[in-house]
């Protein structure tokens, strides 16, 4: 018992951590006073009643992954006031109704990675009221659905079923909840999908499949006996797929009305890009979608990708396209030119150079583009960056980031309007004329520069941390700016006139620097009350780096002597 | 500035395997593809595969899949090339390169020679 | 595999001559409007250098005596006026399809 309690430790709020330990049992003495108690990774292998008996004021419990295959009936009976209880990851092969009868005010329950082949003989959840989000199923003996699992839950924030290996669901199970904002579905086969799906389409607004293979998928008219749908967003997440299963999945996707965002994350795509429709298939509508986002696809024949044509026409409505980590290096300019409402493209950690580029803003190319993010990409001139996005006339906003400039022409061709750049992190070791008068906002953190010295008359907001700068810029070249960022730089002062210079000056972040604490600098700094208003990460940031005997301490504590502001 | 600096040379006997190294510099190394394609004497080049740092993935020429694996180390800026099997035939200089643009190959290594004889 | 003959196998040229070298490849190597075709110089006991990519992109530091053209299955590298430090073999290459394939070069020399 006393090594069980030794490997406890409570604070005075009543948080208690016992993790990753070589409990094997809940440590006794446990009183009303423990409000949070997280057990996880021991080796836990038995609940009794009297365990928790006292812990009444328990709110959360945490028991992930130890060996529990026994939890007495009654274990939980005087915890009225626990809200999150965590029992994923044991040996719970049976799940029981009484323990979790007394939980009134659980809104967070975890069963996932328990071996029950189903969730029991009775309904467990029918009491739990103010349940919010709720983990259940395994990868491998969770077998069953069964239309009483779920009785009683009428509303849920998460719903997220491990169905990995399921055989068997009862029609109707996942009707009876009447609205789950989010639904998180494992299922390794596409066998009863269409079922499910029949289901929740009128409950669920985000739905979102995980680990399927769709690589045989064929989509058979539903008998859903109604059409509305309350699905606005279906995320599918390391799923497989063909050319051919994709058109069934569209032709599943057409049955949501109101279906406004579709993601694909870390999915496989095991095609040619042959998405011709056969003949006796209707033309696919994407209905109302707006958003499409894909992350990290894997398309192993990639380079044998030859006609994305019969998708053109699908994306004229579409508003925002992120297309993240995916190996792109050219978009069609025929495709370009075909998404006509886009407003927002994110081609981040792509492949893309200018050259190419150039192809994909071709003339006519993308006409309501307002944001263009190539973060991470392979570009490395400026100039021709610029120049290749004239194109592209309400163009407002530009994050080049993290792709190797190096060098900055003096001067560039950029969109007219444009309002925003971000060029952080791009190893540029100066700023020219090449930067546009008309930006609000820009960025060139994490580089090279030891000097700002641009005239930016529109400019309100400046991020320039993480540089080399040993002053701040002189004021006078940036009329309008509200906020500066220039912390981790080479600054060692500034003064209240330099600061006072900048009249509209709402937000200054310039920490992280090498300050010389002077006499003057300590007097201004920490007689100005109204600077901690502005220094919006003061007092814990700024820190003396000179004289030797105060380095490293807050600049708001140092006290020079007398002796040292009195030299003569 | 952009440098990719290979092993040295090596000597292997028929049946043998070999591992070659390339180191890089002067740029993000997850962020660009790595290539390997080899040159017997006084012949022309010949694409062996390629490796994505930022996942791993791999590419290769059917003629090398089943003899030749690449890897990375990503903290060292590291890709690697192991050829097993080896034959005379495979007596040529390896080059590494830097895939950019999905495309082309703008940056090479100098190059490591390998003999294969008994 | 798509293979791709150039010609012609070597090509001798006075200082200062134009010198076109061509680069046939046995099927389309055009993807969405874009040319996937490369050109590399290689001089003796040194890796290649990249000349051209995307059929006609000059690579940065480059002279601009150097052009390239050509789509579908026809490509053709110019050099305006040969120069001593332009002997060496060229070689074409396709990105078009896996495995990506060079040709088997053009040996340029000064007469």
């Known amino acids: 018992e006393s090594s069980n309690q030794a490997s406890l430790s409570c604070d005075r709020n009543g948080i208690c951590k016992g993790s990753s330990g070589s409990l094997n049992s809940i440590p006794s003495g446990l009183t009303e006073a423990v409000k949070s108690l997280d057990l996880s990774n021991n080796r836990i292998t038995y609940i009794s009643n009297s365990d928790l008996q006292r812990c009444v004021n328990l709110q959360a419990l945490v028991l992930t992954s130890n060996g529990i295959n026994t939890i007495e009936e009654d274990s939980f009976s005087s915890l009225g006031s626990l809200e999150h209880l965590d029992l994923s990851y044991n040996y719970l092969s049976n799940l029981s109704s009484s323990w979790f009868k007394p939980l009134s005010s659980l809104t967070f329950l975890n069963l996932l990675g328990n071996p029950y082949k189903t969730l029991g003989e009775t309904s467990l959840f029918s009491h739990l009221t103010k349940l919010q989000i709720l983990r259940v199923g395994n990868m491998d003996t969770f077998t069953k659905i069964q239309r009483k699992d779920f009785a009683g839950l009428t509303f849920l924030e998460e719903l997220e079923i491990d169905a990995s290996d399921l055989q068997s669901y009862e029609p109707k199970s996942l009707k009876s909840i009447q609205n789950v904002s989010h639904l998180i579905l494992h299922m390794k086969q596409h066998i009863l999908l269409l079922e499910i799906f029949v289901d929740v389409t009128s409950s669920v607004e985000c739905l979102e499949l995980r680990d399927t293979d769709l690589d045989t998928f064929h989509f058979s008219e539903l008998s859903t006996g109604e059409t509305n749908s309350l699905i606005k967003k279906f995320t599918f997440r390391n799923v497989k797929i063909t050319d051919e299963s994709l058109f069934q999945v569209m032709k599943l996707l057409n049955q949501i009305s109101g279906l406004l965002e579709l993601e694909f994350d870390d999915c496989t795509l095991n095609g040619v890009g042959n998405f011709r429709a056969s003949d006796n298939d209707r033309v696919i509508d994407p209905g109302k979608v707006e958003t499409l986002t894909i992350r990290r696809l894997h398309i192993p024949r990639f380079y044998l990708f030859y006609d994305l044509s019969t998708l053109y026409s699908l994306t004229e409505r579409v508003k925002r396209i992120t297309v993240e980590n995916s190996k792109v290096f050219l978009v069609p300019c025929l495709l370009s030119q075909h998404l006509k409402s886009l407003e927002y493209l994110d081609l981040s950690e792509n492949l893309m150079v200018e050259e190419y580029l150039k192809n994909s803003a071709c003339e006519d190319a993308w006409p309501s583009l307002q944001t263009l993010i190539l973060r991470q990409n392979h570009l490395a001139s400026l100039e021709k960056t610029g120049e290749t996005l004239l194109t592209l006339k309400n163009l407002t906003n530009i994050d080049i980031s993290k792709n190797s400039f190096h060098s900055m022409p003096e001067t560039c061709q950029w969109p007219e309007k444009m309002k925003y750049l971000n060029l952080s992190s791009t190893r540029i070791h100066s700023v020219t004329g090449c930067i546009p008068k008309t930006l609000e906002i820009l960025d060139v953190s994490n580089n090279n520069l030891n000097l700002f010295s641009l005239n930016l008359p529109q400019l309100k907001e400046l991020y320039i941390s993480r540089n080399k700068l040993m002053t701040l810029p002189d004021a006078s070249l940036l009329p309008m700016l509200l906020v500066l960022k220039i912390s981790r730089n080479a600054i060692t002062t500034f003064s209240k006139e330099q600061l006072d210079s900048f009249h509209t000056l709402k937000t200054l972040e310039a920490g992280g620097n090498n300050f010389i604490c002077s006499c003057e600098f300590l007097s201004f700094t920490q007689e100005q009350q109204a600077l901690a208003k502005v220094l919006i990460d003061w007092p814990a940031n700024y820190l003396c780096d000179s004289p030797s005997h105060v380095r490293g301490q807050q600049v708001q504590d140092v006290r020079l002597s007398v002796s040292e502001c009195h030299r003569t | 500035q952009v440098q990719l600096v290979q092993s040295g040379s090596e000597l292997k006997k028929p049946g043998a395997s070999v591992k070659l190294s390339c180191k890089a510099s002067?740029?993000?190394?997850?962020?660009?593809?790595i290539n390997w394609v080899r040159q017997a004497p006084g012949q022309g080049l010949e694409w062996i595969g390629w490796?994505?740092?930022?996942?791993?993935?791999?590419n290769f020429n059917e003629n090398f899949k089943d003899r030749a694996t690449i890897t990375v180390d990503t903290s060292a800026s590291t890709a690697y090339m192991e050829l097993s099997s080896l034959r005379s035939e495979d007596t040529a200089v390896y080059f590494c390169?830097?895939?950019?643009?999905?495309?082309?190959?703008?940056?090479w290594g100098q190059g490591t020679t390998v003999t294969v004889s008994s | 595999d798509i293979v791709l003959t150039q010609s012609p196998a070597s090509l001798a040229l006075s200082l200062g001559e134009r010198a076109t070298l061509s680069c046939r490849a046995s099927?389309?190597?055009?993807?969405?409007?874009?040319?996937?075709m490369q050109w590399y110089q290689q001089k003796p006991g040194q890796p290649p250098k990249l000349l051209i990519f995307?059929?006609?992109n000059v690579e940065s530091g480059v002279p601009d005596r150097f052009s390239g053209s050509g789509s579908g299955t026809d490509f053709t590298l110019k050099i305006s006026r040969v120069e001593e430090e332009d002997v060496g073999m060229y070689f074409c290459q396709q990105s078009r399809k896996l495995p990506w394939t060079f040709g088997g070069g053009t040996k340029v020399e000064i007469k």
């Open positions: 995307g059929a006609s």
């Open positions: 099927e389309s190597v055009e993807y969405y409007g874009t040319s996937l």
């Open positions: 490796i994505y740092p930022r996942d791993g993935s791999t």
């Open positions: 390169a830097r895939l950019t643009g999905g495309t082309f190959l703008d940056y």
């Open positions: 002067g740029f993000t190394f997850t962020t660009y593809g």
